[in-house]
Structures are given as structure tokens and as C-alpha cells.
């Protein structure tokens, strides 16, 4: 019973975690414009792994995809790769763990096979979670480095002609979603690995003992039958998260109700 609960909980936690990793990967707010020196701005910039966006005071939001592949920073490419690897591993892990669930009957699959599949999915979840945490951490480190390199009054020349105030970026919501999701996936993976130990068939020290009754010869083998918990009948696969689709107006940049500028 405890094993089934641990396995089921591990699966659910991992499912939520992977949904979160997918959401974080799709989110546009990996980095947001630092508003420390200018808390009220008419143009607000934020960036994701796939596109950068600008939200104007008017409410108009414009997003532009990073259509170049070679022109992007290597670190950004690495973060993308880590997140995608995390999603792929997590998705495969989820698929494997569905069949590994003790409450789901698939033919005459033995407990040893389920134990192996649980361990495999657990390891996949752990690696998936680590990939997400690593990806988000690499991006966060990149932001911190860039933040201190660019100061509020630092100007960068555009072709020696135009001077633009450098926009500083700070941590966006996606980073926190990614960290939490990666952590959940990792925890779910550990739970699956713990559940695997309980699923593995135990070696029995009992020898088979024959009892001879008159007229019939019946052999009783203690430990030969395992009781199974019947959770299978009402188990449903619920959709935990819906694809990471977001509206542009979901996050409001207004710092306060009344601002004087």
C-alpha cells in the first residue's frame, strides 16, 4: 500500500514538475527589464528563450522571435538544449512510469519488470529535473553577470552614431517557475526510485512443505501468492497543466495604483 502511494505520488509530483518545465520553457518572461532606477516606465521589455517582447503603456505588446540560430549567444543555446532535454526525458519518463504504476494492470507484467520501469522513470525524472535546474541556473548566472556589467548610466554606441541607455534585465517569472518545476520533477524521481525498492520481489526463505491428505495430494506453498491492491478501477489520468499558452496581458507591469513621474 505504502509503495503504491509513494509511486503514485512520485508520478503526480513529476507530472506537475514536467508541466512546469514545459511552461517555463515556453514563457516569455525569463528576464524582465530592471525597474529599480525607473519604477514607472512607458515601455517595458522582457525576454524569453524563443522571443523578446515589449509592452507599451498603451497596452500594445510586440514580440519578436529569435529567427537566427547562429547569431544567438552560446549560453542561450545551451539553456534551450538543457530545457528541451529535460522535457524529452521527462516525457519519456512519464510514459514509462504510466506502465510501471502498480495500480495499472497490463497483461501479465511481472513485479520485477514494473520495478525496473519505476527505477528507469525515476532516474529519468531526476535527470530531467537536474537539466531544468541547470538550465535555469545557467540563465540566471548569465543575467547576474550582464546586470553588473551594465550600469544605469552606461551608454553603448550603436555604430558610433546613436547613443542608447543600456537596458538592464533581472530575473523573470519563468526562472522561478523553472526552479520549482525542476525541484518537483527531481523529488518525484526520487520518490519513484524509493518506490522501486518496495516493488522488487523479495526472496523467500521458506521451503515448500507437502501435506498429504487422504485421497488427494495437494501441495501448499507458503508465500506463493501475493495480495494485490485494487486501485485500478477508478484511476484517471487528469490533465494537470494546459500547455503553457499565455496571453500577453497576463502580467501587469504597473508598480502601484498611483504614480507620480
Amino acid at each position: 500500500m505504502a509503495v503504491t502511494a509513494c509511486q503514485g505520488l512520485g508520478f503526480v509530483v513529476s507530472l506537475i514538475g514536467i508541466a512546469g518545465i514545459i511552461a517555463a520553457t515556453c514563457m516569455d518572461q525569463w528576464s524582465t527589464q530592471d525597474l529599480y532606477n525607473n519604477p514607472v516606465t512607458a515601455v517595458f521589455n522582457y525576454q524569453g528563450l524563443w522571443r523578446s517582447c515589449v509592452r507599451e503603456s498603451s497596452g500594445f505588446t510586440e514580440c519578436r522571435g529569435y529567427f537566427t540560430l547562429l547569431g544567438l549567444p552560446a549560453m542561450l543555446q545551451a539553456v534551450r538544449a538543457l530545457m528541451i532535454v529535460g522535457i524529452v526525458l521527462g516525457a519519456i519518463g512519464l510514459l514509462v512510469s504510466i506502465f510501471a504504476l502498480k495500480c495499472i494492470r497490463i497483461g501479465s507484467m511481472e513485479d520485477s519488470a514494473k520495478a525496473n520501469m519505476t527505477l528507469t522513470s525515476g532516474i529519468m525524472f531526476i535527470v530531467s529535473g537536474l537539466c531544468a535546474i541547470a538550465g535555469v541556473s545557467v540563465f540566471a548566472n548569465m543575467l547576474v553577470t550582464n546586470f553588473w556589467m551594465s550600469t544605469a548610466n552606461m551608454y553603448t554606441g550603436m555604430g558610433g552614431m546613436v547613443q542608447t541607455v543600456q537596458t538592464r534585465y533581472t530575473f523573470g517569472a519563468a526562472l522561478f517557475v523553472g526552479w520549482v518545476a525542476g525541484g518537483l520533477t527531481l523529488i518525484g524521481g526520487v520518490m519513484m526510485c524509493i518506490a522501486c525498492r518496495g516493488l522488487a520481489p523479495e526472496e523467500t526463505n521458506y521451503k515448500a512443505v507437502s501435506y498429504h491428505a487422504s485421497g488427494h495430494s495437494v501441495a501448499y506453498k507458503p508465500g506463493g501468492f501475493k495480495a494485490s491492491t485494487g486501485f485500478g478501477s477508478n484511476t484517471k489520468n487528469k490533465k494537470i497543466y494546459d500547455g503553457g499558452a499565455r496571453t500577453e496581458d497576463e502580467v501587469q507591469s504597473y508598480p502601484s495604483k498611483h504614480d507620480y513621474v
Partner: antibody, heavy 118, light 113 residues
Amino acid sequence: QVQLVQSGAEVKKPGASVKVSCKASGYTFTSYVINWVRQATGQGLEWIGEIHPRGGNTYYSEKFRGRVTLTADTSISTAYMELSSLRSEDTAVYYCAILRRGNAMDYWDQGTTVTVSS
Amino acid sequence: DIVMTQSPSSLAVSAGEMVTMNCKSSQSLLNSGNQRNYLTWYQQKPGQPPKLLIYWASTRESGVPDRFSGSGSGTDFTLTISSVQAEDLAVYYCQNSYNYPYTFGQGTKLERK
């Protein structure tokens, strides 16, 4: 057809308050930000502030801090600009305008003339 | 606050002439996020409210004749009227739409020569 219609001309005494209304039609009122701009006779344009009707968020020019209050009544699609402690230099035409793409004001009303005189 | 300075303060022109007026901002209006310049041009005729001509420094508002064009980046901007018509005689204002408070230039008056 987007339209902004302001209240009529006002004559006020120094120290009094004036409340100018701006009724919007032809679009969803909460979709666009409303800006207020004034223009003294023969002078240039001066930005007063803006209100986001959806959340009621307001941003004011430092010059009018504490004297101006922008409000919006979404039920009747009307924005209001109240200016208190009036002085003679507040005599001007007050415009409301819709802020659109590029933070540009692309729909203006005909303006309300406010005269401050003792 | 961003200070907007327009030059010249007035221009005397004849119909069909090409006209350019300048606008300078005390800070860059170029947003690095989308590489757009947040500068807006308005036209105001006597007794009328201002009319939007150009936003993002060079994007013409729909319905504005193509003889009007905007250019420039960062801190220096220009409004050009390729062939002035009688109905173009008005005051032209540039505006910072990048940072609060939104600030306007003092205007350039276009008059008949």
C-alpha cells in the same frame, strides 16, 4: 467609429476645482489608456497624466502632483480629470486622447476650455 | 524629464516645396528591446486638436498622406514634407513617448511665404 466627447467650457475662480469629463464611444472603453493634455492659448502642448481604465492605474506629471486626479467610470465609459487649487495659469484647453500603438495619442476630442479668473 | 527641442520655431514655405523640421531629445528614445524609437509627430491646425502623423519615429499613421515622412534615431529626428500643400500649414509637435512624463517639443510653425 471611435469618438471622444468632452464636457462644456468652464469658468472658475482661483482656488476652486474643476472636473472635466470625457465620454468615449465606438470601442471597448477598458481596452485603451486615456491621456490628458492641456494647451494654454498660443502655447505648446503639456501632458497632465494618463489613466488605465481597466485597473484604474494612474500616472501623473510631477508638475500636477497633488492637484490633479484622474478617474474612470467604466459603466458609462467616461473618464474624468479633476484639477484643484486653480490658478490663472491653469487657463487652457484641456484635451483627452486615446493612447495607442507606439504610445501615440491617435484620437483626440475637441477640448474643453477652462478659464480661471477672479 | 526628457527635454524635447524643435528647430526651427517657424518656417515660411511655398506650395510644392520640400520642408524638413528637426527634433532633438535630451535622452535617447531608442528602445533596445525592439529597436524602435519612441518619438511621435503631431500636426495641429488653429482651433483644432492635434492630429497624429507619425509614431515610432518613422511609421505613418493610416490616412496620413505619403508626402509626410519621419526619420532619425536615438536623439535626433526629422519630419519631412516632400511637397508642401496649402492644407499642411499648421504647427508640428514632436513628442517623447518613451518615458514618463511624456514631453512635447515647443512646436514648429509652418507658414506661407
